[in-house]
């Protein structure tokens, strides 16, 4: 196996590799730097393995995976050193590297010349005390949101930022506005920003207006 790659969004984490097997099956192992190897996806003919269940146990740990290659019908095949042939993945630290999924604007509400915009707090697959944690629960203040907003009638964008999932912005009375949000982890060196959310505009069903 080669080209071992971590594909991870909001902690849903899959290891992918090549090539598509012809006469091979694969078994994956994963461990933390100090832990024991745990086998997953036994003798699979897929070229991917979902490792989410393992990495969500501690998303701040650094993980390493390896893919063992076995000729079909011979699971005892070994390399020259008497070990099965395997390839190591790059190291992966979910908290620092998982991609931020596309956020969603949950709602917006206008009261006079103020609009309150709320970002949906996406649920992750990280568990604590038998409940799934939200993105905010996991990242805390490391996660901020940037709001882009503009009058429907113009293209000039304004921005606001927040350490929570809410914004409260000033708008001109009688004007309709459109909104898009982006998740950002400023302290990261990679995968700092999500893609922008779908655009939501006033006058559509997510909005509410009160004088």
């Amino acid at each position: 196996a080669f080209n071992l790659t971590w594909i991870s969004t909001d902690f849903k984490t899959i290891l992918e590799w090549q090539p598509k097997p012809t006469n091979y099956t694969y078994t994956v192992q994963i461990s933390t730097k100090s832990g024991d190897w745990k086998s997953k996806c036994f003798y699979t003919t897929d070229t991917e393995c979902d490792l989410t269940d393992e990495i969500v146990k501690d998303v701040k740990q650094t993980y390493l995976a390896r893919v063992f290659s076995y000729p079909a019908g011979n699971v005892e095949s070994t390399g020259s050193a008497g070990e099965p042939l395997y390839e190591n993945s790059p190291e992966f630290t979910p908290y620092l590297e998982t991609n931020l999924g596309q956020p969603t604007i949950q709602s917006f509400e206008q009261v006079g010349t103020k609009v309150n915009v709320t970002v949906e707090d996406e649920r992750t697959l990280v568990r604590r005390n038998n409940t799934f944690l939200s993105l905010r629960d996991v990242f805390g203040k490391d996660l901020i949101y940037t709001l882009y907003y503009w009058k429907s009638s113009s293209s000039g964008k304004k921005t606001a930022k927040t350490n929570t999932n809410e914004f409260l912005i000033d708008v001109d009375k009688g004007e309709n506005y459109c909104f898009s949000v982006q998740a950002v982890i400023p302290s990261r060196t990679v995968n700092r920003k999500s893609t922008d959310s779908p655009v939501e505009c006033m006058g559509q069903e997510k909005g509410e207006f009160r004088e």
Partner: antibody
Framework: QVQLQESGPGLVKPSQTLSLTCTVS?????????WSWIRQHPGKGLEWIGE???????RYNPSLKSRVTISVDTSKNQFSLKLSSVTAADTAVYYC??????????????????WGKGTTVTVSS | EIVLTQSPGTLSLSPGERATLSCRAS???????LAWYQQKPGQAPRLLIY???SRATGIPDRFSGSGSGTDFTLTISRLEPEDFAVYYC?????????FGGGTKVEIK
């Protein structure tokens, strides 16, 4: 209104672990705030130790990270500080504080708006 | 780590006078993350100003904050007897959160 009260031993021996608890009254620890520990060495300035969210998400001061653990017990409405391998340099007044979101410039940002009275911890044999 | 340097270390003034306290950051700090606290002997710090210029609940309007980037100022327009204390600036934008060394405002 919310009040915070630190508790724990006032004297800790060198190399041992300092353990403090902050009890939150008048409000829920799970209500969207963060909870911090700060210390103040005698006659000196303030040093932020770390913070925790009700979910258990933590951030620590890198200078203390290897020795610090902050945890939360939502059922008791408490959060705790453990500082291991203490020396005389850890002698200080330890404060717990609430971090609350305040509106500013279109968004919300967290500031330490409610503090405990502080508890003096002396490290000495 | 962002280092906050406060000056002067001590300010000796009389009641009714104007106090101007400075806080300089070693790198740019967003105004959203700058706060000022007051601390009196034997007491915990008290939040005065957040967002560099917004007064916290219950803080008299003689206290005002200004500044951006690396230079921030706390002004007390007319000192009252209860204002003599130590004042700290704090940034909460970058871990570790840091405080300035403090400015002591004492009675002349």
């Amino acid at each position: 209104q919310v009040q915070l009260q630190e508790s724990g031993p006032g004297l800790v021996k060198p190399s041992q672990t300092l353990s403090l608890t902050c009890t939150v009254s008048g409000g829920s620890i799970s209500s969207g705030q963060y909870w911090s520990w700060i210390r103040q060495h005698p006659g000196k300035g303030l040093e932020w130790i770390g913070e925790i969210y009700y979910s258990g998400s933590t951030r620590y001061n890198p200078s203390l990270k290897s020795r610090v653990t902050i945890s939360v017990d939502t059922s008791k409405n408490q959060f705790s500080l453990k500082l291991s391998s203490v020396t005389a340099a850890d002698t200080a007044v330890y404060y717990c504080a609430r971090d609350t979101p305040y509106y500013y410039d279109g968004g919300y940002y967290y500031y330490m708006d409610v503090w405990g009275k502080g508890t003096t911890v002396t490290v000495s044999s | 780590e962002i280092v906050l340097t406060q000056s002067p270390g001590t300010l000796s003034l009389s009641p009714g006078e104007r106090a101007t306290l400075s806080c300089r950051a070693s790198q740019s700090v967003s105004s959203s993350y700058l706060a000022w606290y007051q601390q009196k002997p034997g007491q915990a710090p008290r939040l005065l100003i957040y967002g560099a210029s917004s007064r916290a609940t219950g803080i008299p309007d003689r206290f005002s904050g200004s500044g951006s980037g690396t230079d921030f100022t706390l002004t007390i327009s007319r000192l009252e007897p209860e204002d003599f204390a130590v004042y700290y600036c704090q940034q909460v934008g970058v871990v570790p959160y840091t405080f300035g060394g403090g400015t002591k405002v004492e009675i002349k």
